[in-house]
């Protein structure tokens, strides 16, 4: 397993519409056909699995159906959305890549992105 | 290095507004936020708000908003807070501050003063 | 919204001697998300901690932070002449981010 470099903005405040998009960039070292996106979310000591990707260089990223990550990728970069977030789903998401194909295998963890997320006010009663 | 360089002091009248300035420089923008706080006079600390230079979005106190505005040029990494229908009680010293997510760089301060 | 309340509200000390400051939250600070600021009169405040007790750089290790949930504390363990001012803490895990009233460290 060797090491690659992997950036992603420090810090973005989710839409009011609870969605949050960013870029995760990798150094790649060789010219990879298949690649393997992960979004982890670390929060109070406890890392989850956000959603995952697997993806053929030049091709869409295809996440479960079922998934609240969407993606498109451009070269060496994943252009990540996460939608139907809350205030209770801020944190810090982190970005791994890993270049499965072909060898040598290539694993690269972003810093993270500290997503906030801000629920909207209510609305106010009306009387209609 | 990391500098927040902020516009010079303001004396504005009760009603009008204000509009403060923030250039960042030696990092990357749109990576990181950028928070305003200001202390008004023997005062401490009051939190106003945030961008995110990543994407626009922002998010404002609740005793503030509707009169404040905060945006990003990113073509010059500059951050602007305008503060609308100023009142005395206005009157404060104004921090920019990178959002890392905690507010590891501060700008020097712009003072303004709201006096009839 | 996160109600942070720091104590005392003034400390009177001599040189050489050690601080310890309080911050408590009205609710738990996800992520240990407390930092301390540092204020000297007519200047911008300075991050010394953030993380609840991860030093900023150039912070001198007579610093330190500790604390988890709703109670957190900052030490000063020998006070230098130059670390007479006002402290304040703030939490940035969720939003409204919020700072603390500051409490003063003052010459005895």
């Known amino acids: 397993c060797k090491a690659m470099h992997v950036a992603q903005p420090a810090v973005v405040l989710a839409s009011s519409r609870g969605i949050a998009s960013f870029v995760c960039e990798y150094a790649s070292p060789g010219k990879a056909t298949e690649v393997r996106v992960t979004v982890l979310r670390q929060a109070d000591s406890q890392v989850t699995e956000v959603c995952a990707a697997t993806y053929m260089m030049g091709n869409e990223l295809t996440f479960l159906d079922d998934s609240i990550c969407t993606g498109t990728s451009s070269g060496n970069q994943v252009n990540l959305t996460i939608q139907g977030l809350r205030a209770m789903d801020t944190g810090l998401y982190i970005c791994k890549v890993e270049l499965m194909y072909p060898p040598p295998y290539y694993l690269g963890i972003g810093n993270g992105t500290q997503i906030y997320v801000i629920d909207p006010e209510p609305c106010p009663d009306s009387d209609f | 290095q990391v500098q927040l360089v902020q516009s010079g002091a303001e004396v504005k009248k009760p009603g009008a507004s204000v509009k403060v300035s923030c250039k960042a420089s030696?990092?990357?923008?749109?990576?990181?936020?950028i928070t305003w706080v200001r202390q008004a006079p023997g005062q401490g600390l009051e939190w106003m708000g945030w961008i995110s230079a990543y994407n626009g979005n922002t998010n404002y106190a609740q005793k503030l908003q509707g009169r404040v505005t905060m945006t990003t040029d990113t073509s010059t990494s500059t951050a602007y807070m305008e503060l609308r229908s100023l009142r005395s009680d206005d009157t404060a010293v104004y921090y920019c501050?990178?959002?890392?997510?905690?507010?590891?760089?501060w700008g020097q301060g712009t003072l303004v003063t709201v006096s009839s | 919204e996160i109600v942070l309340t720091q104590s005392p509200g003034t400390l009177s000390l001599s040189p050489g001697e050690r601080a310890t400051l309080s911050c408590r939250a009205s609710q738990s600070v996800s992520s240990s998300y407390l930092a301390w600021y540092q204020q000297k009169p007519g200047q911008a405040p300075r991050l010394l901690i953030y993380?609840?007790?991860s030093r900023a750089t150039g912070i001198p290790d007579r610093f330190s932070g500790s604390g988890s949930g709703t109670d957190f504390t900052l030490t000063i363990s020998r006070l230098e002449p130059e670390d007479f001012a006002v402290y304040y803490c703030q939490q940035y895990g969720r939003s409204p981010f919020t700072f603390g009233p500051g409490t003063k460290v003052d010459i005895k």
């Open positions: 030696g990092y990357t923008f749109t990576n990181y936020g």
């Open positions: 501050a990178r959002v890392a997510p905690y507010f590891d760089y």
């Open positions: 993380g609840a007790s």
